[in-house]
């Protein structure tokens, strides 16, 4: 069955729900634009996208907030050109994770940096922004294949999606086991990892819209304790 | 104010072929999927076609004119056509063209005035 | 294909009475419908979508209502501007998109 999705006249400062723009769309709002924060997940579908589409149309506010969102969907942007920036939130979450792994109090915590103290990733990962023209397809939360459009209609043109994908390095030194693990009593292996963004998808029956779709996130190390010889 | 406006519109004969145009005007045009709808003379509304803005010419028919007319689009020129073949006696009606959103799942918030097409010998 | 069903046909209400009009689908259609107004040699226009949000401009004497397959449009306080044919449409499952049968609202 199609998704349930929203029709128009939303407003929340972004081009497209939960999705960061880039390049020729900042300045399609004005000087305002992006000042209301992320639309919330559980809000419909389409509420923002196309408050930019119809120039004939006032709109009424979007009144949901969900932090939460930010998370989700800063692994998407629309844009005209390749994002030179990883995604802000990605960097955040990255130093957060230093952050908590090393446990520090938070006086130490204000003034440590992870690449002076020579900390390593259990896991070797690469990351990049990659194009619809490089996914193609993808899975959506029902399981089905769907094709994911190159471009996203704005209101002068169209803009690419972007997806910052990260996935376990294959010539990383972690390719055969994780780092720092004591291979006696475990065996390791780096996996990539999946989650879900929304993204403008079309289904089989040449329906388009937004979906959530599964794209490659993290690269975590699993763990199996060796049985006794 | 967005507009549409239809055209192509008239009496022909039963079997015979007529191609509609819809213009349209204030709104980025090939962003969103279009439709046309037809009334039938005292009767409800009828979807009879879509068509999608992906280009790769993605399009839908109710099965009454299935095989017999083609939506089609030009965005360089804001139109939106429907060629009507081997039309019949049942196919008179108010022709409307109406902008969707751009996905699938939208309702039909603009439309336009209309064009008549009767088919009659 | 969904099929929608509005009753009453038509509609008997003097001016300044409420009006409920309902539409009925053949399945569940996830609040993807929509109502429009048709007056006599105009085309529709569209005053309700996503079942109760109101359209760009529709005053608020119109409201929408329902879930699932049972939807109500209500109009509070009838107008004389008001007097008219009304539809509703679903566009969670198409092709093909699908209208009711339409409920004429007239003056009692």
């Known amino acids: 069955a199609p998704m349930k999705e929203a029709n128009i006249r939303g407003q929340g400062g972004l081009a497209y729900p939960g999705v960061r723009t880039h390049g020729t769309l900042e300045s399609v709002n004005g000087p305002k634009a992006g000042s209301r924060g992320l639309t919330s997940l559980a809000d419909t579908f389409e509420h923002v996208i196309e408050e930019l589409l119809d120039e004939d149309q006032k709109v009424r506010p979007n009144e949901e907030n969900n932090k939460d969102a930010d998370l989700y969907t800063s692994r998407v942007m629309l844009s005209s050109q390749v994002p030179l920036e990883p995604p802000l939130l990605f960097l955040l979450e990255e130093y957060k994770n230093y952050l908590d792994a090393a446990n520090m109090s938070m006086r130490v915590r204000r003034h440590s940096d992870p690449a002076r103290r020579g900390e390593l990733s259990v896991c070797d990962s690469i990351s990049e922004w990659v194009t619809a023209a490089d996914k193609k397809t993808a899975v959506d939360m029902s399981g089905g294949t769907v094709t994911v459009l190159e471009k996203v209609p704005v209101s002068k043109g169209q803009l690419k999606q972007y997806f910052y994908e990260t996935k376990c390095n294959p010539m990383g030194y972690t390719k055969e086991g994780c780092r720092g693990i004591d291979k006696r009593h475990w065996n390791s292996q780096c996996r990539t990892t999946q989650s879900y963004v929304r993204a403008l998808t079309m289904d089989s029956k040449k329906r388009i819209g937004w979906r959530f779709i599964r794209i490659d996130t993290s690269c975590v190390c699993t763990l199996t304790i060796k049985r006794g010889r | 104010e967005v507009q549409l406006l239809e055209s192509g519109g008239g009496l022909v004969q039963p079997g015979g072929s007529l191609r509609l145009s819809c213009a349209a005007s204030?709104?980025?045009?090939?962003?969103?999927?279009m439709s046309w709808v037809r009334q039938a003379p005292g009767k409800g509304l009828e979807w009879v076609a879509g068509?999608?803005?992906?280009?790769?010419?993605?399009?839908y028919y109710a099965d009454s004119v299935k095989g017999r007319f083609t939506i089609s689009r030009d965005n360089s020129k804001n139109t939106l056509y429907l060629q009507m073949n081997s039309l019949r006696a049942e196919d008179t009606a108010v022709y409307y063209c109406?902008?969707?959103?751009?996905?699938?799942?939208?309702?039909?918030?603009?439309w336009g005035q209309g064009t008549t097409v009767t088919v009659s010998s | 294909e969904i099929v929608l069903t509005q009753s009453p046909a038509t509609l008997s209400v003097s001016p300044g009475d409420r009006a409920t009009l309902s539409c009925r689908a053949s399945?569940?259609?996830?609040?993807?419908l929509a109502w429009y107004q048709q007056k006599p040699g105009q085309p529709p226009s569209l005053l309700i979508y996503?079942?109760?949000t109101r359209a760009t401009d529709i005053p608020d004497r119109f409201s929408g209502s329902g879930s699932g397959t049972e939807f109500t449009l209500t109009i509070s306080s009838l107008q004389s501007e008001d007097f008219a044919v009304y539809y509703c449409?679903?566009?969670?499952?198409?092709?093909?998109?699908?209208f009711g049968g339409g409920t004429k609202v007239e003056i009692k």
């Open positions: 109406a902008k969707q959103g751009v996905t699938h799942y939208n309702p039909m918030d603009v």
């Open positions: 204030v709104f980025t045009f090939s962003n969103y999927y």
């Open positions: 068509i999608n803005w992906n280009g790769a010419g993605d399009t």
């Open positions: 399945q569940g259609i996830a609040g993807k």
């Open positions: 996503d079942a109760s």
């Open positions: 449409q679903q566009y969670y499952d198409w092709p093909p998109l699908t």
